[in-house]
């Protein structure tokens, strides 16, 4: 149930956790029980869910998503303050691509955090998450320029380039996600 | 021939805990998606909770997150649902159906249900 | 209240053809999720009926069919019989909702006579 993030420590960035231990991996330890927890995974740099056996396990273990925000996300609680205030990119905007459970093939837009552009993606009909988007407008609109105008200009020439995957299949995914909504 | 038996249902007071199993057979358990699907007495259907083949991604209905745990147990062919913190309108019918079988996105095939009655 | 809504109860004659309705929203069926229709027999667990908007299961009489426009669905059932006295259900998924399953609140159909 542990959950994985080997990537190299490079693509960390500048992004520097407030304490040591939100770096550690997230450990659902040797036993047996199923408690829902959050840990914050370095190289999404957000607090994720995670199933902790109930014994032992690290340090980078909440009882709560707030909780975590605020003890390992540098400057959590100003940008709270902020977003409450403005136009500001929903929750859900930062959510990992989820093609949900089942074997359809939709074509949807999200929001990539690592590019800051709605990207297409191929969801399979079923659950997954809100950063799933019918139409590249409404993705644009909601987390690309959340409250901002009406966009264009080269950005929009180089996004009409890249979804031109999807007339040979979808792309591969290089991660490997582990959800637990 | 496919088959699911849920059982685990019971009467628990509010507030209490109870554990509901499906027992899988006649096909590839760990190949498929699983749900769980409740029904209150005399009223229509609710999804509750999903979970991948594998159980690496699980999802829950608003009504019931943080409060129930869908698992899997693919070496026993079993399917879970740990129910915390339970409530009246929790009182209902508990399906287990497997999920996208041949029908991509339906709920193909169901047991036949165990009653679970959360009462004082 | 459901997500989707189906009228209460619908009934027929033997012999003749019922049609139960399922509305939803742009964010549902109008949002491109299949529909799919379950048939519940009294006492008994639900069945798959209608999948993919029109698709029958191996078992299923050709006299179900289902159908999807825009943001509503229909299941059709022509030559009633008694044995067909059921709740119906439709079921899609919900963006709004990250893409969770919703029912219809069910629909009763009785055969008359």
């Known amino acids: 149930l542990s959950e994985e993030a080997d990537d190299t420590d490079s693509e960390l960035g500048s992004m520097k956790p407030l304490h040591t231990f939100c770096a550690m991996k997230a450990d659902d330890g040797p036993c047996k029980a199923m408690i829902r927890s959050y840990f914050f995974n370095m190289y999404t740099h957000q607090c994720e869910e995670f199933i902790y056996g109930g014994c032992e396990g690290n340090e980078n273990r909440f009882d709560t998503l707030e909780e975590c925000k605020k003890t390992c996300i540098p400057g959590y609680e100003k940008t709270a303050v902020k977003a409450a205030s403005g136009a500001e990119r929903p929750d859900f905007c930062f959510l990992e691509e989820d093609p949900g459970l089942c074997r359809g093939y939709m074509k949807r837009y999200l929001y990539n955090n690592q590019t800051k552009q709605c990207e297409r993606f191929v969801y399979g009909g079923c659950l997954g998450n809100r950063n799933n988007f019918e139409t590249l407008d409404e993705c644009k609109k909601i987390c690309e320029n959340p409250g901002g105008g009406s966009g264009g200009g080269l950005n929009d020439i180089f996004e009409a380039q890249k979804i031109e995957w999807h007339e040979g299949g979808p792309p591969h995914h290089h991660h490997h996600h582990h959800h637990h909504h | 021939q496919v088959q699911l038996v849920e059982s685990g249902g019971g009467l628990v007071q509010p507030g209490g805990s109870l554990r509901l199993s499906c027992a899988a057979s006649g096909f590839t358990f760990s190949s498929y998606a699983m749900s769980w699907v409740r029904q209150a007495p005399g009223k229509g259907l609710e999804w509750v909770s999903a979970?991948?083949?594998?159980?690496?991604?699980?999802y829950y209905a608003d009504s019931v997150k943080g409060r129930f745990t869908i698992s899997r147990d693919n070496s026993k062919n079993t399917l879970y649902l740990q129910m915390n913190s339970l409530r009246a309108e929790d009182t209902a019918v508990y399906y287990c159906?497997?999920?996208?079988?041949?029908?991509?996105?339906?709920?193909?095939?169901w047991g036949q249900g165990t009653m679970v009655t959360v009462s004082s | 209240q459901s997500v989707l809504t189906q009228p209460p109860s619908v009934s027929g004659a033997p012999g003749q053809r019922v049609t139960i309705s399922c509305t939803g929203s742009?964010?549902?069926?109008?949002?491109?999720?299949?529909v799919h229709w379950y048939q519940q027999l009294p006492g008994t667990a639900p069945k798959l009926l209608i999948y993919g908007n029109s698709n029958r299961p191996s078992g299923v009489p050709d006299r179900f069919s289902g159908s999807k426009s825009g943001t509503s669905a229909s299941l059709a059932i022509t030559g009633l019989q008694a044995e067909d006295e059921a709740d119906y259900y439709c079921q899609s998924y919900d963006s709004s909702l990250s893409g969770s399953g919703v029912f219809g609140g069910g629909t009763k159909l009785t055969v008359l006579g």
């Open positions: 159906a497997i999920l996208g079988a041949t029908s991509l996105s339906a709920f193909d095939i």
């Open positions: 742009s964010s549902n069926i109008g949002a491109g999720y299949d």
């Open positions: 979970i991948s083949g594998s159980g690496g991604s699980t």
